[in-house]
C-alpha cells in the first residue's frame, strides 16, 4: 500500500459500498501523487478502533462517546478532523442531543421510569451517555452494573451494541442488539424508527434526526421533544429544548504516526469535490444505501482539529467527567463545606521546589502538579489533572477562552483592606539604557529586544499590539534584529539573545535565564537595547535589592523609559510614560473548583502571606528572591474579584480587544484548540 493511502474503516456492507465509491471517485479527481483511499471492513466501531490502533486501518468517523473509548489505552487514538454542521460561514462543531416522543403519549422527562426506550447505541453520545448520564443518579439502587440498572428503569429497550445475553431487556425491542446497520434500529435513524414503529416510547437521538427521516412537516408534527423543565416542545424548538450540546462526530487516527496531515489533505479535497451541493454522481454527506454512512448525512463539511487537541480537550472536561461518572457509578454526595486538596500547577523545576515546600506547610491542603509551560498547565487545569495557578493577564485571556475562570487577583499595593479591593492594574513599560540616548519608541526597528515571554501582557501583548498597529504585520522577528522572547520558535531571531542552555534555550519557564520580568531586564543589562517589563521591575532589581551577581551593582538612574510620544523619562515617572495599563496577575481555576480554590487560598494567605515577617525561617507564599515563583514576589495579598469573575470582566474590554487584535499573530496552539471548541 503506498504511503499516501488512507485506509478507511467501514462497519457494514453498505458503508463498504460507499467507501469503494468514495475511493473510485477520489481517484478520478486527485492526481496520482495525491492521497488515495483504501477500504477496510470491520464488524463494529470498536473493531475499527482496534484495527486503527493495530495499524491495520487509518481512519474512521466516530460519535463523541466512542471518541472517548478510542482515546483510552491501549487504543490511544486522537481526533484529527471534525464534521461541522450549520453553514460554512457559521460552522458548528456540536449538535443537540434530544429526547423525541409521540405527541399523544403524555409523559415528561421526570416520568420516564417504566417507559420503553430507543437508543442509537451503547456508549454513544446522544443515544446513551447524555440521557443515561442525566437519569443515572435518579435510578433505583443498586446502580451497578449500569446496564442492569438501566434495564430495570425502563420496561424494555433497544440499545444496540449491548450484551444481549447478560442484559436481554436492553435488546427486547431489537432482537440481538446488533452493532451495525444490519440492526434496523441501530444509529440515529434506527432509534427513531424504533419510536416510529411503536416499539419504543422515547428515542434518544440528535436534533436533526427527525428532519432527516420525515420530510413532511405534518408528519413531524406528530412528535415532540421532552425538555429538562419537564415540559414538551415542538421538534423544531430543539435550541430551547435539548438534553445537551454534544461535540460533533470526528475522524480519529493514531496519536503517533497517524497520518493526520494526509487524512486532512484527503478529506479537504473530498469536500471540495464531493461536499454539499458539489457533485451529482457522488456525495460525501449522503447515504443512498442507508443513513449516516461513513459520515453523518447532516454534516456540511470538515474542519481540521488543531494538533494540540487530544480527545479529552475535544470532548471537554464536563463530558469526560460525565462518562467517567457513568461508568464508575459515581453520584454526587450531598454538598459539603469540605474541600479536596487544591492541585497547584507548577512550572518546571524551580516552581516545583517552592510548591512542594508550600504543600508540606499546608498540611495536605495543597498538592503539586508539574508542567513545562504555562499552556501545558492551563491544559492540565482544563482536564482536571490540576486545579489552579496564578497567571499573567495574557494567559488569563487564553485560560478564559479555554473555559477557566479567574478567582482571586494578585494585589501589589499595601492597603488597609487589601483582600477586599482588587487593584486597577500595573503599568507595562519599555526600558532602555540611559547611555543609548538616541533610542526612542519611534526608532526601535533593527534593535535588540527583551521580552518576558510570548503571550504575556507587559512583555508581549501590549508592546507587540502597539507595534502591530504601526507595522500591520506579524513578522516581529524581522522588525527587531534579534531578541529574547521565550516561547518563540527556536530558529527565530527572537530566540537569538536568550541564554538558556541546550533544550532550555528560549523555553517559557525559569530554566531560561531571560524568562519573566527579571529575566527580560537581565537581558537588557547584558545584551539588549530595550526590555518590555512592568513598572516595578527596574526598582526591584537595582540599588542592591537583587543580590545576584549580574544585578547587585545596578543603579536605577542608569535606565530610562520610552514614552509613546517619542520622548523619554526617568524610571520613577512611569505614571506619565508607559505603554498601557495591564491587568494584575490572577489565579484561575475551573468553574467546579471555584469555591474551594477561593476558600483554601484565602486560608493559605492568612497563614503564609505578607503578614509573615521572617521568610528566612518560615515559608512565605509571595517570596522567591525576585524569581516570581508561583506568584509575583511583589504580591501583597490575593484579593476578591467581586463581580469581575469572568475573564472578560476581569481583563476589561480594552485589553480583551487588544489581545483579540493580536490573535492574528498568535502562535498559541492552546488558544487555537480552545477557540475551535468555543469560537
Amino acid at each position: 500500500v503506498p504511503d499516501k493511502t488512507v485506509r478507511w474503516c467501514a462497519v457494514s456492507e453498505h458503508e463498504a459500498t460507499k467507501c469503494q465509491s468514495f475511493r473510485d471517485h477520489m481517484k478520478s479527481v486527485i492526481p496520482s501523487d495525491g492521497p488515495s483511499v483504501a477500504c477496510v471492513k470491520k464488524a463494529s466501531y470498536l473493531d475499527c478502533i482496534r484495527a486503527i490502533a493495530a495499524n491495520e486501518a487509518d481512519a474512521v468517523t466516530l460519535d463523541a462517546g466512542l471518541v472517548y473509548d478510542a482515546y483510552l489505552a491501549p487504543n490511544n487514538l486522537k481526533p484529527v478532523v471534525a464534521e461541522f454542521y450549520g453553514s460554512k460561514e457559521d460552522p458548528q462543531t456540536f449538535y443537540y442531543a434530544v429526547a423525541v416522543v409521540k405527541k399523544d403519549s403524555g409523559f415528561q422527562m421526570n416520568q420516564l421510569r417504566g417507559k420503553k426506550s430507543c437508543h442509537t447505541g451503547l456508549g454513544r453520545s446522544a443515544g446513551w451517555n447524555i440521557p443515561i448520564g442525566l437519569l443515572y443518579c435518579d435510578l433505583p439502587e443498586p446502580r451497578k452494573p449500569l446496564e442492569k440498572a438501566v434495564a430495570n428503569f425502563f420496561s424494555g429497550s433497544c440499545a444496540p451494541c449491548a450484551d444481549g445475553t447478560d442484559f436481554p431487556q436492553l435488546c427486547q425491542l431489537c432482537p440481538g442488539c446488533g452493532c451495525s446497520t444490519l440492526n434496523q434500529y441501530f444509529g440515529y435513524s434506527g432509534a427513531f424508527k424504533c419510536l416510529k414503529d411503536g416499539a419504543g416510547d422515547v428515542a434518544f437521538v440528535k436534533h436533526s434526526t427527525i428532519f432527516e427521516n420525515l420530510a413532511n412537516k405534518a408528519d413531524r408534527d406528530q412528535y415532540e421533544l421532552l425538555c429538562l423543565d419537564n415540559t414538551r416542545k415542538p421538534v423544531d424548538e430543539y435550541k430551547d429544548c435539548h438534553l445537551a450540546q454534544v461535540p460533533s462526530h470526528t475522524v480519529v487516527a493514531r496519536s503517533m504516526g497517524g497520518k493526520e496531515d494526509l487524512i486532512w489533505e484527503l478529506l479537504n479535497q473530498a469536500q471540495e469535490h464531493f461536499g454539499k451541493d458539489k457533485s451529482k454522481e457522488f456525495q460525501l454527506f449522503s447515504s443512498p444505501h442507508g443513513k449516516d454512512l461513513l459520515f453523518k448525512d447532516s454534516a456540511h463539511g470538515f474542519l481540521k482539529v488543531p494538533p494540540r487537541m487530544d480527545a479529552k480537550m475535544y470532548l471537554g472536561y464536563e463530558y469526560v467527567t460525565a462518562i467517567r461518572n457513568l461508568r464508575e457509578g459515581t453520584c454526587p454526595e450531598a454538598p459539603t463545606d469540605e474541600c479536596k486538596p487544591v492541585k497547584w500547577c507548577a512550572l518546571s523545576h524551580h516552581e516545583r521546589l517552592k510548591c512542594d515546600e508550600w504543600s508540606v506547610n499546608s498540611v495536605g491542603k495543597i498538592e503539586c502538579v508539574s508542567a513545562e509551560t504555562t499552556e501545558d498547565c492551563i491544559a492540565k487545569i482544563m482536564n482536571g489533572e490540576a486545579d489552579a495557578m496564578s497567571l499573567d493577564g495574557g494567559f488569563v485571556y487564553i485560560a478564559g477562552k479555554c473555559g477557566l475562570v479567574p478567582v482571586l487577583a494578585e494585589n501589589y499595593n499595601k492597603s488597609d483592606n487589601c483582600e477586599d479591593t482588587p487593584e486597577a492594574g500595573y503599568f507595562a513599560i519599555a526600558v532602555v539604557k540611559k547611555s543609548a540616548s538616541d533610542l526612542t519608541w519611534d526608532n526601535l526597528k533593527g534593535k535588540k529586544s527583551c521580552h518576558t515571554a510570548v503571550g504575556r501582557t507587559a512583555g508581549w501583548n501590549i508592546p507587540m499590539g502597539l507595534l502591530y498597529n504601526k507595522i500591520n504585520h506579524c513578522r516581529f522577528d524581522e522588525f527587531f534584529s534579534e531578541g529574547c522572547a521565550p516561547g518563540s520558535k527556536k530558529d527565530s531571531s527572537l530566540c537569538k539573545l536568550c541564554m538558556g542552555s541546550g533544550l532550555n534555550l528560549c523555553e517559557p519557564n525559569n530554566k531560561e535565564g531571560y524568562y519573566g520580568y527579571t529575566g527580560a531586564f537581565r537581558c537588557l543589562v547584558e545584551k539588549g537595547d530595550v526590555a518590555f517589563v512592568k513598572h516595578q521591575t527596574v526598582p526591584q532589581n537595582t540599588g542592591g535589592k537583587n543580590p545576584d551577581p549580574w544585578a547587585k551593582n545596578l543603579n536605577e538612574k542608569d535606565y530610562e523609559l520610552l514614552c509613546l510620544d517619542g520622548t523619554r523619562k526617568p524610571v520613577e515617572e512611569y505614571a506619565n510614560c508607559h505603554l498601557a495599563r495591564a491587568p494584575n496577575h490572577a489565579v484561575v481555576t475551573r468553574k467546579d473548583k471555584e469555591a474551594c480554590v477561593h476558600k483554601i487560598l484565602r486560608q493559605q494567605q492568612h497563614l503564609f502571606g505578607s503578614n509573615v515577617t521572617d521568610c528566612s525561617g518560615n515559608f512565605c507564599l509571595f517570596r522567591s528572591e525576585t524569581k516570581d515563583l508561583l506568584f509575583r514576589d511583589d504580591t501583597v495579598c490575593l484579593a476578591k474579584l467581586h463581580d469581575r469573575n469572568t475573564y472578560e470582566k476581569y481583563l476589561g474590554e480594552e485589553y480583551v480587544k487588544a489581545v483579540g487584535n493580536l490573535r492574528k499573530c498568535s502562535t498559541s496552539s492552546l488558544l487555537e484548540a480552545c477557540t475551535f471548541r468555543r469560537p
Epitope: I130, C137, D138, Q245, G316, E318, P332, A334, E594
Partner: nanobody, 124 residues
Framework: QVKLEESGGGLVQAGGSLRLSCAAS????????MAWYRQAPGKERELVAG???????NYADSVKGRFTISRDNAQNTMYLQMNSLRPEDTAVYFC??????????????????WGQGTQVTVSS
Amino acid sequence: QVKLEESGGGLVQAGGSLRLSCAASGNVFTIAAMAWYRQAPGKERELVAGITTGGSTNYADSVKGRFTISRDNAQNTMYLQMNSLRPEDTAVYFCNAVTKWAARVGGSAEYEYWGQGTQVTVSS
C-alpha cells in the same frame, strides 16, 4: 437555566423556629443536589445543609440536631426546618443548586445556580 426563589425568612426570638422554602423552576431535571448556605454580615458565605436528588443529606456541625433539610422532588422544592434558633444563626440564607455533569456538556448548563437570599434574624 434554573431559577431559585427562597421564602420563609423573618424575625424570630431565640429558641423559636422557622421553615425556609426554596422553589426551583426552569430546567429542574438538570439538578443533582441542592443546598442552603448563609452569610452573616462581614463573614464568608458558609454551607448550612445539603441534599441530593436521591435524598442523602449533610449538615454543618453548628446546626446538627437543630436544622433539618428536606426535598419534595415532585414540587421541585427544598425546605430547611430550623428549630432552637440562636442569635448566631442570624444571616441571609441562600438556596443553591448544583447541576448534573451530563447537563453541562457543551456548556448546556451552568455549574451551579443561586437564589437571591432571604433574611433570617434571631433576636435574644
